[in-house]
């Protein structure tokens, strides 16, 4: 005799497979606020969507626990090396977790790059940083993107800088 | 009394889970035709495969609507900066969508890089560009990879430059 | 009359969906042994985990056949160009497959970069290399990460250099 509970769970599994959590958020001019906070994102227009995930002040917020592949790309660019970016200071791009159990953000995936060559140069340069990896997130935990040197992040049309996740 | 329709759907869900759309296409010497078109790909030999996705003239073609993680990596290389690649002109690598309603390609994910340093330099250089993100695709829509400066794409044995997707 | 076997398979499918193979391994000080072997990884502490995959001497080991999205990021850094890294020799970062049928490792995904600019320079530089793509793996096959110039890999707290996979 088949367990109705199991049947319900299977039906639910099919439904949830159809709506497995996923999101893709895109960069906008308001993404980099220059406040030292995380980057902010477009969540609804253009290529952006949220399916089974929430959004709050730059953060993707999980509604169910599980393993998620999280990713972010940022488009970097400038002319020469901006003041304060010494030759030995890289651009740091990272994905960080916020959780109620710890007051400080936890590093998840981080990249460092020296994109602008020699500070003396006045040439225009472009670089791109991609991060992606699988992390475990509890329901209600938040993931944000930070670029310490946010003045170098180039935002245009939502295709150059973005942030997303999906459950695996 | 269990609904046979639901049972069939569950059996189908299991089958389709087993065969969830996925593809990985690899670079070949014919990938870069120098015609201004998208890059072309190997679809069957070596590491390349198509499962629940089609291929047509460089494009991955969806057979079912859904959210897909699409990705591409291109291996770039050269000696100094090729003629026409001014110091402020980057290499642009992008994933683009083709759909019948909008005949001009729509940007999905794009990266810019200044890989070759100073134009005066005659040194050999290598760089790699990776893109990946989740996008929604209707059945029959096409995704292509473009590198505007395609003469810089270095193709060798299908592991350096590639293009793929899977449903999430 | 519904096939019990099918029911069992569906129940199994639901269980396996819950526990679909996935892993994320992180860099540690012992990752780069300088022996010419693959990079070694943390499998349990911090962000690292194994779910339905095994680990052996730097390798992720599959327990079931299927298509896997495999990925790796390595953080590179140095001062100037180290001895032996001629201006035309790139850093090579790759994912390779080991299988009992072939004695030599098979290239899966490979990247080349010239991260350190001119060898004469004594400046500090940082770069990051990301690889990801879908490959088919049989049960018991192994995937490893190699960076030929492993002295350039910078390891710190498991967020800069990592290696993972999940079934698609």
């Amino acid at each position: 005799d088949q367990d109705t509970g199991s049947w319900e769970q299977l039906v639910q599994a099919r439904r949830s497979h159809k709506a497995s959590p996923a999101a893709h958020l895109t960069g906008a001019n308001s993404s980099s606020m220059g406040t030292g906070g995380p980057l902010l994102w477009e969540t609804q227009l253009g290529l952006a969507f949220l399916r089974g995930l929430g959004y709050h002040d730059g953060a993707l917020v999980t509604t169910q626990a599980g393993y998620y592949y999280i990713y972010s790309k940022v488009q970097l660019g400038g002319v020469g090396c901006p003041q304060g970016l010494a030759t030995d200071l890289p651009v740091t791009h990272g994905l960080y977790k916020r959780t109620t159990r710890y007051p400080e953000e936890l590093e998840l995936l981080v990249s460092r790059r020296s994109p602008c060559g020699r500070a003396a140069s006045s040439r225009v340069w472009w670089d791109s940083s991609f991060l992606g990896g699988v992390v475990h997130l509890e329901a209600g935990e938040e993931v944000v993107v930070r670029v310490l040197e946010e003045q170098l992040v180039r935002l245009r049309d939502g295709t150059r800088s973005y942030f997303g996740a999906f459950m695996v | 009394d269990q609904d046979t329709g639901s049972w069939e759907q569950l059996v189908q869900a299991r089958r389709s889970h087993k065969a969830s759309p996925a593809a990985h296409l690899t670079g070949a010497n014919s990938s870069s035709m120098g015609t201004g078109g998208p890059l072309l790909w190997e679809t069957q030999l070596g590491l390349a495969f198509l499962r629940g996705l089609g291929y047509h003239d460089g494009a991955l073609v969806t057979t079912q609507a859904g959210y897909y993680y699409i990705y591409s990596k291109v291996q770039l290389g050269g000696v100094g900066c090729p003629q026409g690649l001014a110091t402020d002109l980057p290499v642009t690598h992008g994933l683009y969508k083709r759909t019948t309603r909008y005949p001009e390609e729509l940007e999905l994910l794009v990266s810019r890089r200044s890989p070759c340093g100073r134009a005066a330099s005659s040194r050999v250089w290598w760089d790699s560009s990776f893109l990946g993100g989740v996008v929604h695709l209707e059945a029959g829509e096409e995704v292509v990879v473009r590198v505007l400066e395609e003469q810089l794409v270095r193709l060798r044995d299908g592991t350096r430059s590639y293009f793929g997707a899977f449903m999430v | 009359d519904q096939d019990t076997g099918s029911w069992e398979q569906l129940v199994q499918a639901r269980r396996s969906h819950k526990a679909s193979p996935a892993a994320h391994l992180t860099g540690a000080n012992s990752s780069s042994m300088g022996t010419g072997g693959p990079l070694l990884w943390e499998t349990q502490l911090g962000l690292a985990f194994l779910r339905g995959l095994g680990y052996h001497d730097g390798a992720l080991v599959t327990t079931q056949a299927g298509y896997y999205y495999i990925y790796s990021k390595v953080q590179l850094g140095g001062v100037g160009c180290p001895q032996g890294l001629a201006t035309d020799l790139p850093v090579t970062h790759g994912l390779y497959k080991r299988t009992t049928r072939y004695p030599e490792e098979l290239e899966l995904l490979v990247s080349r970069r010239s991260p350190c600019g001119r060898a004469a320079s004594s400046r500090v530089w940082w770069d990051s290399s990301f690889l990801g793509g879908v490959v088919h793996l049989e049960a018991g096959e192994e995937v490893v990460v190699r960076v030929l110039e492993e002295q350039l890999v910078r390891l710190r707290d498991g967020t800069r250099s990592y290696f993972g996979a999940f079934m698609v």
Partner: antibody
Framework: QVQLVQSGAEVKKPGASVKVSCKAS????????ISWVRQAPGQGLEWMGW????????NYAQKLQGRVTMTTDTSTSTAYMELRSLRSDDTAMYYC??????????WGQGTLVTVSS | QSALTQPASVSGSPGQSITISCTGT?????????VSWYQQHPGKAPKLMIY???KRPSGVSNRFSGSKSGNTASLTISGLQAEDEADYYC??????????FGGGTKLTVL
Amino acid sequence: QVQLVQSGAEVKKPGASVKVSCKASGYTFTSYGISWVRQAPGQGLEWMGWISAHNANTNYAQKLQGRVTMTTDTSTSTAYMELRSLRSDDTAMYYCARLYRNWFDPWGQGTLVTVSS
Amino acid sequence: QSALTQPASVSGSPGQSITISCTGTSSDVGGYNYVSWYQQHPGKAPKLMIYDVSKRPSGVSNRFSGSKSGNTASLTISGLQAEDEADYYCCSYAGSSTLLFGGGTKLTVL
């Protein structure tokens, strides 16, 4: 092909509510937003807001906050726009449109709502 | 956020070219390549003519073209025809899940 078909014209008294429907076909309904735009007689287009069909997130124009509610029924691929506490200046042609990326395409044929005592 | 600024009316003779402007700010028109244009004939629903500043959907005549310079987008109609007489509206993405319409321009074919 992609099509949006709206419900018929309505005549309402001030203070009443109206609910306009918009049935979609020819595409994956849950993968796009539905936007509502109105046009008073002889006036320009006024964006009212939209709803995301896959997660029911809404975004309403400031001036209509508290009076407008947008909903969807994914089982019938239908979007609804309800406007409460109607006033005479709500008399307008109400259009639904699929929100595709950052533009509206296609549009419904329009529903004329007349508010008159 | 206020509406984008369009001229109230423009006119031209058959065969001529006309241009309709749409002026915004660096936070909308100038900040993104997300400007669209709509044509509306009397008593009809609006119709998409241009998206992403300069791209035409299938079925739209190549006599219609779009461009952008700074904070101003433009719709140009060449070889003006009688059936082009209609109202035209621009629309721009303005960040933070916001889209802005222009006030509309009435095109008269003389």
